[in-house]
Amino acid sequence: AGVFELQIHSFGPGPGPGAPRSPCSARLPCRLFFRVCLKPGLSEEAAESPCALGAALSARGPVYTEQPGAPAPDLPLPDGLLQVPFRDAWPGTFSFIIETWREELGDQIGGPAWSLLARVAGRRRLAAGGPWARDIQRAGAWELRFSYRARCEPPAVGTACTRLCRPRSAPSRCGPGLRPCAPLEDECEAPLVCRAGCSPEHGFCEQPGECRCLEGWTGPLCTVPVSTSSCLSPRGPSSATTGCLVPGPGPCDGNPCANGGSCSETPRSFECTCPRGFYGLRCEVSGVTCADGPCFNGGLCVGGADPDSAYICHCPPGFQGSNCEKRVDRCSLQPCRNGGLCLDLGHALRCRCRAGFAGPRCEHDLDDCAGRACANGGTCVEGGGAHRCSCALGFGGRDCRERADPCAARPCAHGGRCYAHFSGLVCACAPGYMGARCEF
């Protein structure tokens, strides 16, 4: 177990032309806060995939109001580190996403009070217990300077926080005739991991998960001093070597403390000492909870059903992501039918319909012939979002208003001669041919 720590040094306009002056203005003061998301291995840095190693949300920074005419400074930052506790081994390679959020402090009618200013992501190799690593990342016109490290929570040590260290036995605990004890120093029993909560002073292990007590101590975690009267007692099973009672199952057996918490027995039950970022009777509650306001853009926070998911965000229409931080491209779902043009106005979706269609999603096919008359006995034919006239013989054009020359298309075959007639056309066929169009 251990903690990933992130220290933001500065956030402000990057070098070069086109850099923004400030995300805040004299008219609209604002403050910044940060979110970090960690994933094990060199995985894709997709913002919506789960932060399997953990996530943290900073406090809000001081309020900043831009001074007109003044050079753009680095913006005031929240105090303190962002800390992401991890309960298992530190993976060594990890991916991170750091988001810079702006909270607008004016009354923004029609717009969210939060907006994502910048998102930087990267993949790094990092050994636990090493020095702070410094980094500079640019996102668009913004520049973020930060440091990070992974450190193990005692008694864990090592580059992956998987080795447990305990002090050697003090000289006074050595029995007569036994080899002299080594001076008090850290002794790493790699790769042994004793039972969580096993007393570092009075306990040790030779197998993973066990907790064996030095002489004079008992209990599942070697925290209970043995009084001489309890030895060689007829009650309960006794140890062949000491004659002292072998403890039965205790409240800390199986370690009820989640998320790397260590268990200690109390007179009535047990107590968990939780790593940073977790709390609750069994350290089951994650550092980021509903009380931190983790859901953006008007989302609602719902307490998680299981201890590993401390909260779930219920996002309003138009937003998605584990924190409702992503605006949905609602036009990508192609909601406008019949070739309508989709417009996402933020607060609403609009469809601009082609001629002949109507409705919020262009779903209604209008009666193209309504109010449309075809002249000279033509009949209206509906279709394709526009009306069309089927004209009587001798007439043409969109509305059958133009007198047509029925002979223009040379309808008489085999050299027949065409004559226009009030009822249409007449073909005078060449010798040897017959039919309305001299086709026979």
Epitope: Q108, A113, G293, L300, G303
Partner: nanobody, 130 residues
């Protein structure tokens, strides 16, 4: 489905009292900032009071401080707005709203603005006559 149900509105003489209720589900109640807004005809919707049921101090707009009290009943997943010493200018449609907020931000004027909230009740009318 998100459910916010207001009740308790009505007509009252100036100087009188009313108590509005806003009931929601237990999944939403306690995990979110609960706020009361009001909207008078022809005016913007304004924040009146807010509370984070899981803890923290309540917030009141200056116009209602000392006259309105926001409270909660955890067993009923309900937030109340006790309105005393009512004035004609308190006449408005009153709405209950909820959203994810930190406990601290729930108690700020900048937090309790219309644009910060996406989930609303249907509203209850309060009319104060002189």
């Amino acid at each position: 489905q998100v459910r916010l149900v207001e009740s308790g509105g009505g007509s009252v003489q100036a100087g009188g009292s009313l108590r509005l209720s806003c009931e929601t589900s237990r999944y939403i109640y306690g995990n979110n900032c609960m706020a009361w807004f009001r909207q008078a005809p022809g005016k913007e919707r304004e924040g009146v009071a807010s509370i984070y049921p899981a803890g923290g101090r309540p917030y009141y707009a200056d116009s209602v401080k000392g006259r309105f009290t926001i409270s909660q009943d955890n067993a009923k997943n309900t937030v109340y707005l006790q309105m005393d010493s009512l004035k004609p200018e308190d006449t408005a449609m009153y709405y209950c709203a909820a959203r994810s907020f930190s406990i601290a931000d729930c108690a700020t004027q900048s937090g309790i603005t219309r644009s910060n909230f996406a989930y609303w009740g249907q509203g209850t009318q309060v009319t104060v006559s002189s």
